[in-house]
């Protein structure tokens, strides 16, 4: 079938990075500068994307693949092809429909994007809170209360049970 197809359509022999040039007897010509063809058998090459303004070049255009953009620092991409840039929030915030909002008590976000996540519930693992959580950081769980009974070797006392920032029980 492939042989039949190539006999019928000489363009099918043109590999990625070339185009089937009708002006030159359907010879496979290389894509001109700033253009590419990612599949074989194409009759034209596509113009390379230019990453301008808020968009930065993540991957240069080649004869077989388009350029890829990302966003300038302080912004992150929206969509598979990074067609828009959206402002990052700060750590300790999440982007809501109303913009960047601080994480609610009992939740944290240690990144500049994504959502606030609940603090780890240490007691579910039979552990106690060693370091209280904040908007930016999860709680740090320590040894279980049983491990801290008299004679146990731990030197770090558990945090008081009702202190602000304590993981919800």
């Amino acid at each position: 079938f492939e042989r039949t197809r190539s006999l019928q359509d000489p363009c099918s022999n043109c590999p990625a990075g070339t185009f089937c040039d009708n002006n030159r007897n359907q010879i496979c010509s290389p894509c001109p500068p700033n253009s590419f063809s990612s599949a074989g058998g194409q009759r034209t090459c596509d113009i390379c994307r230019q990453c301008k303004g808020v968009f930065r070049t993540r991957k240069e255009c080649s004869s077989t693949s388009n350029a890829e953009c990302d966003c300038t620092p302080g912004f992150h991409c929206l969509g598979a092809g990074c067609s828009m840039c959206e402002q990052d929030c700060k750590q300790g915030q999440e982007l809501t429909k109303k913009g960047c909002k601080d994480c609610c008590f009992g939740t944290f976000n240690d990144q500049k994007r994504g959502i606030c996540r609940p603090w780890t519930n240490c007691s579910l693992d039979g552990k106690s809170v060693l370091v209280n959580g904040t908007k930016e950081r999860d709680v740090v769980c320590g040894p279980s209360p049983a491990d801290l009974s008299p004679g146990a070797s731990s030197v770090t006392p558990p945090a008081p049970a009702r202190e602000p920032g304590h993981s919800p029980q």
Partner: antibody, heavy 116, light 107 residues
Framework: QVQLVQSGAEVVKPGASVKVSCKAS????????MHWVRQAPGQGLGWMGA????????DYNQKFKDRVTMTADTSISTAYMELSRLRSDDTAVYYC?????????WGQGTLVTVSS | DIQMTQSPSSLSASVGDRVTITCRAS??????LNWYQQKPGKAPKLLIY???RLHSGVPSRFSGSGSGTDFTLTISSLQPEDFATYYC?????????FGGGTKVEIR
Amino acid sequence: QVQLVQSGAEVVKPGASVKVSCKASGYTFAGFEMHWVRQAPGQGLGWMGAIDPKTGGTDYNQKFKDRVTMTADTSISTAYMELSRLRSDDTAVYYCTRDLGYFDVWGQGTLVTVSS
Amino acid sequence: DIQMTQSPSSLSASVGDRVTITCRASQDIRSNLNWYQQKPGKAPKLLIYYTSRLHSGVPSRFSGSGSGTDFTLTISSLQPEDFATYYCQQSEKLPRTFGGGTKVEIR
């Protein structure tokens, strides 16, 4: 806060040129493309073109390609749009706007009236 | 060029009404669709970007949906300050193009 402030209204004669300025503040001017959009009285919005202040590279709407020139001066965070060979149907409000893939901040607009 | 067709071109509604404006692109624009609100004598203001993301400070009664070629702006409960003209705009390809606008008037 991020702001775009445009030059004042202009009355110009047919055949003449007009140059509208757009001064940016509150952000890194060179880091964002500036686009220009116009709106004739009682009409909708029409995209004219864009400039990348960092490189001076431009993209123009074919409709204006031979009459429009967009420039930018990064030292004073200002973009310019010059339209030549003005006709009466160029009477419009001209807006500059910052691009993130969407136009998040707009200038207040500059009314250009073409009249003899 | 990608043509953007908005409907209706105008509508009359009352405070509290649910209002829906549609925008159709002449070819696939994925989710690269933005909505703007404009009041007389003022510059347009961004409402929604990337089809459904609310710009900061925009009330949650505004929402957007769709993908490909068909998109919708919905105002769940119209408020007096929402009487304005609304424009859709595609960012898929240059030239950037706008819909013709939908004027929302008081009934």
